[in-house]
Interface confidence: low
């Protein structure tokens, strides 16, 4: 029977800069029941706080609700693992909420085949930003990426859409059924998961772009 091994805070993510969650990996348990606590202070302060919510993020997590999230402050945090034989501490992790945002996927992806009379046909897609993100505040610039592939193909074709919430693609294989997905990321932060796939059937008379 030994003291617990050193835990590691391996990930912190925020969906919207207003709340965030951090997760840790336990070290070895030393063969005894082990209790974990996360303590933190905001940089420039000496007073320590304990994690406000160990429940919301699931096992081995600490969730910081809206009230505990300061966007312009760096959090310095550490996890303490304790059993009857002793304690061990993770390394300190410095977290700036601005840099850990991972939004939810974009919403309402719609895809249409457009066949204007005077121009080549194209695939037109549009989507909405995730609801948790308030773009009006100016705190966010969201960038988007689209991927699509014929249903039975292995490889995805990826297009960067910048800040647009709509996009046109001209080069497609007639008669194929395509899967289309979109994801987003803030200017500083992480890509969201891909949105659920939207399917679109390309007509057999769709004219390939020269």
């Amino acid at each position: 029977q030994l003291p617990p091994g050193k835990p590691e805070i391996f990930k912190c993510r925020s969906p919207n800069k207003e709340t965030f969650t951090c997760w840790w990996r336990p070290g070895t348990d030393g063969g005894l029941p082990t209790n974990y606590s996360l303590t933190y202070h905001r940089e420039g302060e000496t007073l320590m706080h304990e994690c406000p919510d160990y429940i919301t993020g699931g096992p081995n997590s600490c969730h910081f609700g809206k009230q505990y999230t300061s966007m312009w402050r760096t959090y310095v945090m550490m996890v303490n693992a304790t059993n009857q034989m002793g304690s061990s501490f993770s390394d300190e992790l410095y977290v700036d909420v601005t840099y850990i945002v991972q939004p939810d996927p974009p919403l309402e992806l719609t895809v249409e085949v457009k066949q204007p009379e005077d121009r080549k046909p194209y695939l037109w897609m549009k989507w909405s930003p995730p609801t948790l993100i308030d773009l009006k505040t100016g705190w966010f610039t969201l960038l988007y990426e689209i991927r699509l592939k014929p249903e039975k193909a292995a490889e995805w074709e990826t297009h960067f859409a910048g800040q647009q919430t709509e996009f046109k693609i001209l080069s497609l294989h007639p008669g194929q059924k395509y899967l289309v997905q979109v994801r987003c990321k803030p200017d500083h932060g992480y890509w969201s998961a891909w949105s659920p796939a939207t399917f679109i059937q390309i007509p057999s008379d769709f004219i390939m772009n020269d």
């Epitope: 606590s37 905001r42 302060e45 320590m48 706080h49 304990e50 919510d53 009230q67 402050r73």
Partner: antibody, heavy 117, light 107 residues
Framework: QVQLQESGPGLVKPSQTLSLTCTVS?????????WNWIRQFPGKGLEWMGY???????SYNPSLKSRITISRDTSKNQFSLQLNSVTAADTAVYFC??????????WGQGTTLTVSS | DVQITQSPSSLSASPGDRITLTCRAS??????LAWYQEKPGKTNNLLIY???TLHSGIPSRFSGSGSGTDFTLTISSLQPEDFAMYYC?????????FGQGTKLEIK
């Protein structure tokens, strides 16, 4: 409904120790949140003194750190304030309050404490 | 510590009036300012936090704005029950600090 109620002696002599208790009903102080003491001086100014969190950790205002202790009795769902070496400058209305993430969403009615010989 | 200056120290107004109270911080506190209402015989009431977030159960006639060092609490149409003492509190830095209060009186 969460309710907080302060209790204490009302009068303390200079250099003695002030002891106040806050009884919480409608919520367990070990479930969540931090449980604070705040005082209001006769001129109406408010000062945050410190807290004890649901886990038992404490934070104190640096201006009081050498004199203050906040503790709790979980069996009675109470937390307490001790302030050593009081002077007339500690005369105030003392409030207990629940910390809703750096702000205070539930307060007690307050108890008046006079330091006088 | 962050100093909070609240103005005016007292204000006379009539029911139905729109009034604005001000708090100024001695340094940048971003959006992290709260407002409370104090009435005799009642417990203090949290109105607004994070500058503009209305606490649950607070009427929409109360609103907060500002960031950095300058903040305002606006009551759009005063009701008789709004005549009270109002305090602001910064919640960006330790230790938490409060303004000296504004007494809102019936004209």
């Amino acid at each position: 409904q969460v309710q907080l109620q302060e209790s204490g002696p009302g009068l303390v002599k200079p250099s003695q120790t002030l002891s106040l208790t806050c009884t919480v009903s409608g919520y367990s102080i070990t479930s969540d949140y931090a449980w604070n003491w705040i005082r209001q001086f006769p001129g109406k100014g408010l000062e945050w003194m410190g807290y004890i969190s649901y886990s038992g950790s404490t934070s104190y205002n640096p201006s009081l750190k050498s004199r203050i202790t906040i503790s709790r009795d979980t069996s009675k769902n109470q937390f307490s304030l001790q302030l050593n070496s009081v002077t007339a400058a500690d005369t105030a209305v003392y409030f207990c309050a629940r910390d809703y993430g750096y702000v205070f969403d539930y307060w007690g009615q307050g108890t008046t404490l006079t330091v006088s010989s | 510590d962050v100093q909070i200056t609240q103005s005016p120290s007292s204000l006379s107004a009539s029911p139905g009036d729109r009034i604005t109270l001000t708090c100024r911080a001695s340094k940048n506190i971003y959006k992290y300012l709260a407002w409370y209402q104090e009435k005799p015989g009642k417990t203090n009431n949290l109105l607004i936090y994070s500058g503009s977030t209305l606490h649950s159960g607070i009427p929409s006639r109360f609103s907060g704005s500002g960031s950095g060092t300058d903040f305002t609490l606006t009551i759009s149409s005063l009701q008789p029950e709004d005549f009270a003492m109002y305090y602001c509190q910064q919640h960006n830095d330790y230790p938490y600090t409060f303004g000296q209060g504004t007494k809102l009186e019936i004209k």
